[in-house]
């Protein structure tokens, strides 16, 4: 599907003293759907600071944010999902910037859980399966999932394998042997909805067994 | 007011290429998408393409894809929309739309005739 | 592509009643209460007009006298009292898949 919010990139800021960043969050408790807004400027004294979004609502015209330490939070189920809302930075009932945004385009998956790995000797390879809570949603239900695995001691040579499924088969021959490895996996929306990652799953670590030849069998 | 003001109407032979441009007014520009609408003669509407005025982004309708090509001047909050090859069936009124959600259209421009004849 | 099947090819419905238009998408076009259909009214050179966004909410400035309903393949758009100026071609709009294709529209007419 075409569009123009690329996933992962965050909205464009204002440039100014108070841009700021936001993510949607569809059916995160039951029916209601939340939004989150953070300053990009971690020193930015938020004192005083107010965010309101206004448009694209069902009954109300507009809602307030509740702050929770430094980041601003809404969890309604009155987002109409259709149309752009206009969500500004005020203070004492004063806009100081303003960003037009369509929340089906900000969304944020929940995190994958339940990582697991086991090992099919007869197979010779490694069974990973995850769980995610979007299989029992009615919006964001279709999600491109990322695996990234690596060997423990190699600390930035991380393997991707996208996947829309929560089952994926790694070959032991295209692991190393006797190592400890750490997988882990994260998601993001893959039809109509657009956004960013979610946050990665907790890693699991799994250790490959060592070469089993069989009498006679050269080494590779 | 919120306005989409396009170019006038042009006539062209086959082969050619037409460039008609919109100029967006009355909003902030860089905060809506820009498509193009085109309808032929009698006919109904079709849809050929976006475009993100952010970013510069597009979106096209793989109907016109290698024949089409949208740009934005945000510097005079314009959007242009290139038709290449063009055939006597490109013949239409072509629309330049503001998106005001995914992806319906609630501000439309005049229109600009496009005439292919040889 | 989607395609969208408008009925009937043309209305005429006397001043005053109701008139009725039906669009029928080949797949479904929505999730979950989500619809992403929209109705648009053209009028002889004029370009289009928005009437309806997401099959049910009426666009601002646009007469109560319109409305839209229906989910996944079945959408409709009802004038509930017909006045003249009303007479035009309706257009329904899918935008759950590139590319966003229009119905074939529908002429209204008076009787």
């Known amino acids: 599907e075409s569009g123009y919010a690329q996933n992962g990139d965050l909205e464009d800021a204002e440039l100014d003293d108070y841009s700021f960043s936001c993510y949607s969050q569809l059916e995160v408790n039951g029916s209601q759907h939340s939004l989150t807004c953070a300053f990009e400027d971690p020193d930015v004294n938020t004192t005083n600071l107010e965010f309101e979004i206004c448009g694209a609502l069902v009954e109300v015209k507009c809602l307030s944010f509740r702050k929770l330490q430094e980041i601003y939070f809404i969890e309604t189920k009155k987002f109409l999902l259709i149309g752009k809302s206009n969500i500004c930075v005020k203070v004492g009932g004063k806009s100081l910037t303003c960003k037009k945004i369509d929340l089906t385009t900000i969304v944020k998956p929940e995190a994958p859980f339940d990582l697991s790995v086991i090992y099919r000797e007869g197979a010779n390879d490694f069974v990973v399966t995850f769980n995610t809570s979007h299989l029992q949603k009615k919006y964001v239900k279709v999600l491109m999932h990322d695996v990234a695995y690596r060997q423990e001691k190699d600390e930035n040579k991380w393997m991707h394998v996208n996947l829309s499924s929560t089952k994926l088969t790694l070959l032991q021959r295209n692991l190393q042997p006797e190592a400890m490895y750490e997988i882990k996996v994260r998601s993001i929306p893959d039809h109509y909805f657009k956004g960013f990652w979610s946050e990665w799953s907790p890693s699991y670590y799994f250790r490959t067994p060592e070469i089993n030849n069989s009498p006679g069998e050269m080494d590779p | 007011q919120v306005q989409l003001v396009q170019s006038g109407a042009e006539v062209k032979k086959p082969g050619a290429s037409v460039k008609v441009s919109c100029k967006a007014s009355?909003?902030?520009?860089?905060?809506?998408?820009l498509h193009w609408v085109r309808q032929a003669p009698g006919q109904g509407l079709e849809w050929m393409g976006g475009?993100?005025?952010?970013?510069?982004?597009?979106a096209y309708n793989q109907k016109f894809k290698g024949r089409v090509t949208m740009t934005r001047d945000t510097s005079t909050s314009t959007v242009y929309m290139e038709l290449s090859s063009l055939r006597s069936e490109d013949t239409a009124v072509y629309y330049c739309?503001?998106?005001?959600?995914?992806?319906?259209?609630?501000?439309w421009g005049q229109g600009t005739t496009v005439t292919v004849s040889s | 592509d989607i395609v969208l099947t408008q009925s009937p090819d043309s209305l005429a419905v006397s001043l005053g009643e109701r008139a009725t238009i039906n669009c029928r998408t080949s797949?479904?076009?929505?999730?979950?209460?989500?619809?992403?259909m929209h109705w648009y009214q053209q009028k002889p050179g004029q370009p289009p007009k928005l009437l309806i966004y997401g099959a049910s909410n009426l666009e601002s400035g646009v007469p109560d006298r319109f409305s839209g309903s229906g989910s996944e393949t079945d959408f409709t758009l009802t004038i509930s009292s017909l006045q003249a100026e009303d007479v035009a071609v309706y257009y329904c709009?899918?935008?759950?898949?590139?590319?966003?294709?229009f119905g074939g529209g529908t002429k209204v007419e008076i009787k």
């Open positions: 739309a503001r998106s005001g959600g995914r992806w319906y259209f609630d501000v």
């Open positions: 709009q899918q935008s759950i898949k590139d590319p966003y294709t």
């Open positions: 797949e479904s076009v929505s999730i979950h209460l989500l619809h992403l």
């Open positions: 475009i993100d005025p952010k970013t510069g982004g597009t």
């Open positions: 009355g909003y902030r520009f860089t905060d809506y998408e």
